[in-house]
């Protein structure tokens, strides 16, 4: 078998809402993956599991099942959404995300994704991790790759 390539492209959109009373931020983050099948037979993308971390804390998880079948030597772009919640011990972020003197309220999130593919009863898992900027102050649609956090070091948070 040849490789199945998974490329995390970036954040496609982030939609934000707030619970004013609870000082809680809700971010629905839609990400884009490119999955390439380099084989001469079809493979099934069985599931995608994703999680988002802020400051080493998991703030959201998602799982998609029975997603698609990718034909021989084909590539498919798949969007998946992770609902995230920034609350409780991180409620100090509420003041940052709702601060009116700032134009862009970028926070650095770590996106983790694992893609499980199957072919002829064989299962394969491919994982990726990326740091991404997300604006927690307004609804934002990104050009693909625009939200990438290029610093290879863990950001101070």
């Amino acid at each position: 078998p040849r490789s199945i390539d998974v490329k995390y492209i970036g954040v496609k959109s982030a939609y934000v809402s707030y619970d004013v009373q609870k000082r809680t931020i809700y971010l629905n983050i839609t990400n884009t993956l490119n999955i390439t099948n380099n084989n001469y037979y079809s493979v099934e993308v069985e599931n995608i599991t994703a999680q988002v971390q802020f400051s080493k804390t998991v703030i959201g998880k998602a799982r998609l099942n029975n997603i698609t079948i990718i034909g021989p030597l084909d590539m498919k772009q798949i969007d998946y959404t992770v609902p995230t919640v920034i609350a409780e011990e991180m409620s100090y972020m509420y003041d940052f995300c709702t601060l009116i003197s700032i134009k862009v309220h970028n926070i650095v999130l770590m996106m983790q994704v694992t893609v499980t593919t199957t072919y002829f009863g064989h299962s394969e898992q491919i994982s990726q991790e990326r740091y991404q900027y997300v604006d927690c102050g307004r609804n934002t649609t990104y050009q693909l790759g625009q939200s990438e956090y290029l610093n290879v070091l863990q950001p101070q948070q």
Partner: antibody, heavy 122, light 112 residues
Framework: EVQLQQSGAELMRPGASVKLSCTAS????????MYWVKQRPEQGLEWIGR????????EYAPKFQGKATMTADTSSNTAYLQLSSLTSEDTAVYYC???????????????WGQGTSVTVSS | DVLMTQIPLSLPVSLGDQASISCRSS???????????LEWYLKKPGQSPKLLID???NRFSGVPDRFSGSGSGTDFTLKISRVEAEDLGVYYC?????????FGGGTKLEIK
């Protein structure tokens, strides 16, 4: 240290113009809106307007439209307030302000200059 | 413009008393993001204004817990539970929800 340093007191003649400066240290003004506030002697605070230093886009309270002009120079990290056609009504202390993120933990700080006194007298 | 009206203009108190200042906006000051940017400042002579409360009731860092803010819609209140000498000065409410932002007329807290 995060702070705003304003230019010194001005004594001006009626009809003249004056340009006040507000220099930021400890943060980049292009990341924030900068605000200007007026306080006349024995009077209350008045919001003059705000400027986005990155593109120079400014919004004014109607009362100060035509009287005040806000500009900014990101290379010197300085915001400016120009007041034209000065009258005794412009005698006041003028403050610049903003609210900034002052550390890597996203904590906010309300930041004000010390104020610049402008006296208009013949 | 949003007009901010403060009551009273002057508030004579004895040290240790509770003080209450009212602020009313001429229209609702809920921002498009759902937050209400109603703030309270203390201004002392010769000093820059100091932020006490933002978003109606959120005490700013370093502000003593004797200060509290409340309200909703168009009616807001600042309470000082036990007035101390350092609390004397002029208090201003401020709305930062709709441009142009506006201050209230101020309330002078003074010794009775």
């Amino acid at each position: 240290e995060v702070q705003l340093q304003q230019s010194g007191a001005e004594l001006m003649r009626p009809g003249a113009s004056v340009k006040l400066s507000c220099t930021a240290s400890g943060f980049n003004i292009q990341d924030y809106y900068m605000y200007w506030v007026k306080q006349r002697p024995e009077q209350g605070l008045e919001w003059i307007g705000r400027i986005d230093p990155e593109d120079g886009d400014a919004e004014y309270a109607p009362k100060f439209q035509g009287k005040a002009t806000m500009t900014a120079d990101t290379s010197s990290n300085t915001a400016y307030l120009q007041l034209s056609s000065l009258t005794s009504e412009d005698t006041a202390v003028y403050y610049c302000s903003t609210r900034v993120i002052y550390d890597g933990y996203y904590r906010t700080m309300d930041c004000w200059g010390q104020g610049t006194s402008v006296t208009v007298s013949s | 413009d949003v007009l901010m009206t403060q009551i009273p203009l002057s508030l004579p108190v004895s040290l240790g008393d509770q003080a209450s200042i009212s602020c009313r906006s001429s229209q609702t000051i809920v921002h498009s993001n759902g937050n209400t940017y109603l703030e309270w400042y203390l201004k002392k002579p010769g000093q820059s204004p100091k932020l006490l409360i933002d978003k109606i009731s959120n005490r700013f860092s370093g502000v003593p817990d004797r200060f509290s803010g409340s309200g909703s819609g168009t009616d807001f209140t600042l309470k000082i539970s036990r007035v101390e000498a350092e609390d004397l000065g002029v208090y201003y409410c401020f709305q930062g929800s709709h441009v142009p932002y506006t201050f209230g007329g101020g309330t002078k807290l003074e010794i009775k």
